[in-house]
Interface confidence: low
C-alpha cells in the first residue's frame, strides 16, 4: 500500500499558499506542490522555488533549500576566483588563485574555499613572497627557498668583491615590488673615482669620491655652450666613459628690445656683436614683464640668437576684472601676454553660452572680454504635478507653470500653480499634497507666540517658527512641522525671574554692580547679591550667586 | 699629519677677482679627499663656497658657481680659489678644509688657520 | 638648496650644567650631518660627523644624535673651554652650514 506523505515542514523555506493547503494532508505519493526557499538558500535546482512530490519513500527533494553563499562575500586581496558563477550552494567548492608573487598560507599560488551552513569556510589569503634571487659574485647568508613580505635575506661577497665602498655583506628586503634591490657584488678593482672635470660644464648631482661598476654620471654645459657628446658617463673596469665637450655658440648683434631696454645700453652698445654666452641685464617698461614675471631679468646669447626672444611681454591685472556672480580660483594677481585664465560660475549661474565655467586671454590691449555669468534655474523635480511647458534651463524671472495630478492639490481647493527663476534658485518647489494630509494652524503656547500670520491650512512639511516673550526661555526646538495632518511638538516658553526692590529689601540685599529696582533673569542665569551697607551675611556665600530656575530664585539674607 | 696653509693677497678692489692658494703639507693631494673653500663674513655664520678633488672635479656652492673658479695643482701639493666680480660681500675670512677619509660625502676635519681678504677701493 | 635652522641663537648654561643645541633641515639629510666648535679668532674644530660619532679626540661629553631632518648636540658637562659658537653642517646634498648657536656662561 503507498504510504501517504504528511504537511512537509520545509527548513529555511515554505509551500506556497500552506495555509489553504495544510487542510488536504496527509497527500496521496504522486502529489507535487510548489515551494519556495528564504533568502540565501536555494532549491536542489538552483532556484528560488520548485516542486516537492510526495514518493513512496516520503517528500523528495529530501532537504528541498540549501545554503548558499556569494561570491560577493570573498574579499581576496592579491587574488581572485576565475570561476564565473556568483552564486554557491552548499557543500560546494570554489578555487582561488594568488597573483604572481603572492602565495596562501601554505605556499600555494592556489587554494579553496566551501560554502557552509554559516557561510564560506574561511577568508581566502595571498600572502606577498620573494623567491630566492640570483646572485651576482655573492651567496646568501641563510637557507629556505621563498620569504614573507618584509622578511630579510642576508647576503656576503665572494672574495675580492664588495657591495658598496668597503662592504662587503649587506640584506635586501622582501618588498611589495620583490626583492628592495638584486644582490650583486663588484669587483674592488673596477671602481671609479669621481668623475672627469670638463671645460665649460659640470655634473649635475653632487660627485663622491667612490662610484661602483656601471654608475651613471650625468654632465650639463653652463649656459651658451652646447653639449657634444652623450651627456652620461658610466664607470666601467675602473675606468670612466669619454666625458661629453660644451662648444660655444655663435655671437648676437644689439638687442632690439621692444617695451624695454638694456641698462646702461649706450655705454654697452660699442661692444656688440657678442659672443655666445654673453649675459645682460634689461628692464621692460610700465604694463610690461619679463617671461619669470619681473620688471627686470638678463637676456642672453644663445646659438639661435637672443633668448628671451621676446623680452618683454605685457601684462593684464587680475583686479581689472569685474565678475559679478562668478570667480576665479587663481591665485595669481599679474598675467603676461597670451596667457588665458579661467573663471567659474557660482552654483546656478551660468555663462553666455551655458557652461560653467569660462576663459579670458590677455592680450595686447588688455583682457580679451570681462566673464560674464548670468543668472540660471534647472528644471525641477515635481512632486505629484508636471509642468505645463516644455524647455530645460530658465533665465532670471522666468515664470513655469505647473499642474497637480488627481486627487492633489497645492493649497486650499488650488491645482495649478507657478514658480519663478529668482536669484537663489525657483521661488519655491513645484509640490501637489494629498488634501488629508494638510494641517490646519499651528498650536498656541504660553508666553509665546509664532513668529510669522497663521493660516488656516497647511500643507505638509509646512513650518512655522515660535518665539518667547522677553525674558522667558525657550525650551525644546522653536520649529514645529506639519506631518500627516499634525503639527510635531511646539516649544515652552520657561518664566524668567523678576528680581524685585521689594523682595531685596525683606532680605537686606541689593544686586552686586547693578542699580536696577526690577531685574529679570533667564533660567539658568546666575544672579549676583550683596549685603546692603552696615548688614552682614546670614546666609552661605554661594547663595550670593544665586540661580534662576524656571522663576525661581532663593534669596540670600543679609542681617 | 697633515696641514693646510692659505696665502694670497689680503685687499682686492670692487669688480676685481679675488685669488687664494692653498698649501697642503704632510700629506698628498691626491689622496681620497675633497679640498675645500668656506668662507666667514665678519661677524656672520660659516659659508661653503666649493670644493676640488685631485682629479680636478669640483663642487660649487650653486648661487656662487658663476663667480668661482677652482684648480689644482698636484706637482705643488696645492689648490686654488678664484672669486672673479668681487664686491664688498665678498669681504671675509676664507679658509681651506679637508674632508674626512672615508665614505663617499664627509665632514670637514682639517682647516687652515683662514685668511683675511677685504674687497675696497 | 638645503636650509639649515639653528636654535636656539644664544644659549646662556652655568659651567657644570648640560646644555642641547638643535638643528633642522629643510629635507632630509639622512645621518650626513656634522657639528663644529669655533672660538674667536680660530678656524672651526670638528666635534660630530655621521649625526652621532665623535671625532679624534673629542671629549665623552659631547654627542650627537638624530637622523633625518631632526638633530641634537648634547654637551653633558660644560667646562670654561666648551663656551664658544656652534655650527652644524649638513654633506648629503652640497654643503650647508646652520646660523650658528652661541653657547655663553650664564
Known amino acids: 500500500e503507498v504510504k501517504p506523505c504528511d504537511f512537509p515542514e520545509i527548513q529555511h523555506g515554505g509551500l506556497y499558499y500552506k495555509s489553504l493547503r495544510r487542510l488536504y494532508f496527509p497527500a496521496a505519493a504522486g502529489q507535487s506542490y510548489s515551494y519556495y526557499c528564504d533568502q540565501n538558500f536555494v532549491t536542489p535546482s538552483g532556484s528560488y522555488w520548485d516542486y516537492i512530490h510526495c514518493t513512496q519513500d516520503g517528500w523528495s527533494p529530501t532537504v528541498p533549500c540549501l545554503r548558499t553563499c556569494s561570491k560577493s562575500d570573498v574579499e581576496i586581496e592579491n587574488g581572485f576566483i576565475s570561476e564565473s558563477s556568483s552564486i554557491y550552494i552548499l557543500n560546494e567548492e570554489t578555487q582561488y588563485n594568488c597573483k604572481p608573487g603572492y602565495a596562501t598560507a601554505e605556499g600555494n599560488s592556489s587554494g579553496s574555499i566551501t560554502c557552509l551552513q554559516n557561510g564560506w569556510s574561511t577568508q581566502p589569503i595571498c600572502i606577498k613572497f620573494c623567491d630566492m634571487p640570483v646572485f651576482e659574485n655573492s651567496r646568501a647568508k641563510s637557507n629556505g627557498m621563498w620569504f614573507k613580505l618584509h622578511d630579510t635575506l642576508d647576503y656576503e661577497c665572494y672574495d675580492g668583491y664588495e657591495s658598496s665602498y668597503g662592504n662587503t655583506t649587506d640584506s635586501i628586503v622582501c618588498g611589495e615590488d620583490g626583492w628592495s634591490h638584486l644582490p650583486t657584488c663588484y669587483n674592488s678593482s673596477e671602481n671609479c673615482g669621481p668623475p672627469p672635470p670638463i671645460s665649460n660644464g659640470d655634473t649635475t648631482s653632487f660627485p663622491q669620491k667612490v662610484y661602483l661598476p656601471w654608475s651613471r654620471v650625468e654632465y650639463q654645459c653652463q649656459s651658451y655652450y652646447e653639449l657634444q657628446g652623450s651627456k652620461y658617463v658610466t664607470c666601467s673596469n675602473g675606468d670612466w666613459s669619454e666625458p661629453p665637450r660644451c662648444i660655444s655658440m655663435k655671437p648676437c648683434e644689439f638687442p632690439e628690445i621692444q617695451h624695454g631696454h638694456l641698462y646702461y645700453e649706450n655705454t654697452r652698445r660699442p661692444y656688440f656683436p657678442v659672443a655666445t654666452g654673453q649675459s645682460y641685464s634689461y628692464y621692460c617698461d610700465q604694463n610690461f614683464v619679463t617671461p619669470s614675471g619681473s620688471y627686470w631679468d638678463y637676456i642672453h646669447c644663445t646659438q639661435d640668437g637672443w633668448l628671451p626672444t621676446v623680452p618683454c611681454l605685457r601684462t593684464c591685472s587680475k583686479s581689472d576684472i569685474e565678475i559679478e556672480n562668478g570667480f576665479i580660483s587663481e591665485s595669481s594677481s599679474i598675467y603676461i601676454l597670451n596667457k588665458e585664465i579661467q573663471y567659474k560660475c557660482k552654483p546656478g549661474y551660468a555663462t553666455a553660452d551655458g557652461n560653467s565655467s569660462g576663459s579670458i586671454t590677455c592680450l595686447q590691449n588688455g583682457w580679451s572680454a570681462q566673464p560674464i555669468c548670468i543668472k540660471f534655474c534647472d528644471m525641477p523635480v515635481f512632486e505629484n504635478s508636471r509642468a505645463k511647458s516644455n524647455g530645460m534651463r530658465f533665465k532670471l524671472h522666468d515664470t513655469l507653470d505647473y499642474e497637480c495630478y488627481d486627487g492633489y492639490e497645492i493649497s486650499y481647493g488650488n491645482t495649478t500653480g507657478s514658480i519663478v527663476c529668482g536669484e537663489d534658485g525657483w521661488s519655491h518647489f513645484p509640490t501637489c499634497y494629498n488634501s488629508s494630509e494638510k494641517c490646519g494652524p499651528p498650536p498656541p503656547i504660553s508666553n509665546g507666540d509664532t513668529t510669522s500670520f497663521l493660516l488656516k491650512v497647511y500643507v505638509p512639511q509646512s513650518r512655522v517658527e515660535y518665539q518667547c516673550q522677553s525674558y522667558y526661555e525657550l525650551q525644546g526646538s522653536n520649529y514645529v512641522t506639519c506631518s500627516n495632518g499634525e503639527w510635531s511638538e511646539p516649544p515652552r516658553c520657561i518664566h524668567p525671574c523678576i528680581i524685585t526692590e521689594e523682595n531685596m529689601n525683606k532680605n537686606n540685599i541689593q544686586l552686586k554692580g547693578k542699580s536696577d529696582i526690577k531685574y529679570y533673569a533667564k533660567t539658568g542665569d546666575t544672579i549676583e547679591f550683596m549685603c546692603k551697607l552696615g548688614y552682614n551675611a546670614n546666609t552661605s556665600v554661594l547663595s550670593f550667586q544665586a540661580v534662576c530656575r524656571e522663576g525661581i530664585v532663593e534669596y540670600p539674607r543679609c542681617e | 699629519q697633515v696641514q693646510l696653509q692659505e696665502s694670497g693677497p689680503g685687499l682686492v678692489k670692487p669688480s676685481g677677482t679675488l685669488s687664494l692658494t692653498c698649501a697642503v703639507s704632510?700629506?698628498?693631494?691626491?689622496?681620497?679627499?675633497?679640498w675645500s673653500w668656506v668662507r666667514q663674513s665678519p661677524g656672520k655664520g660659516l659659508e661653503w663656497i666649493g670644493e676640488i678633488y685631485h682629479t680636478g672635479s669640483t663642487n660649487k656652492k650653486p648661487s656662487l658657481k658663476s663667480r668661482v673658479i677652482i684648480s689644482v695643482d698636484k706637482s705643488k701639493n696645492q689648490f686654488s680659489l678664484k672669486l672673479i666680480s668681487v664686491n664688498a660681500a665678498d669681504t671675509a675670512i676664507y679658509y681651506c678644509?679637508?674632508?674626512?677619509?672615508?665614505?663617499?660625502?664627509?665632514?670637514?676635519?682639517?682647516w687652515g688657520q683662514g685668511t683675511m681678504v677685504t674687497v675696497s677701493s | 638648496e638645503i636650509v639649515m635652522t639653528q636654535s636656539p641663537a644664544t644659549l646662556s648654561v652655568s659651567p657644570g650644567e648640560r646644555a642641547t643645541l638643535s638643528c633642522r633641515a629643510s629635507q632630509s639629510v639622512s645621518s650626513n650631518l656634522a657639528w663644529y666648535q669655533q672660538k674667536p679668532g680660530q678656524a672651526p674644530r670638528l666635534l660630530i660627523y655621521?649625526?652621532?660619532t665623535r671625532a679624534t679626540g673629542i671629549p665623552v661629553r659631547f654627542s650627537g644624535s638624530g637622523s633625518g631632518t631632526q638633530f641634537t648636540l648634547t654637551i653633558s658637562s660644560l667646562q670654561s673651554e666648551d663656551f664658544a659658537v656652534y655650527y652644524c653642517q649638513q654633506y648629503d646634498n652640497w654643503r650647508t652650514f646652520g646660523q650658528g648657536t652661541r653657547l655663553e656662561i650664564k
Open positions: 655621521g649625526a652621532s
Open positions: 678644509a679637508r674632508d674626512r677619509e672615508g665614505g663617499t660625502t664627509e665632514a670637514f676635519d682639517i
Open positions: 704632510g700629506g698628498s693631494i691626491s689622496s681620497s679627499n675633497w
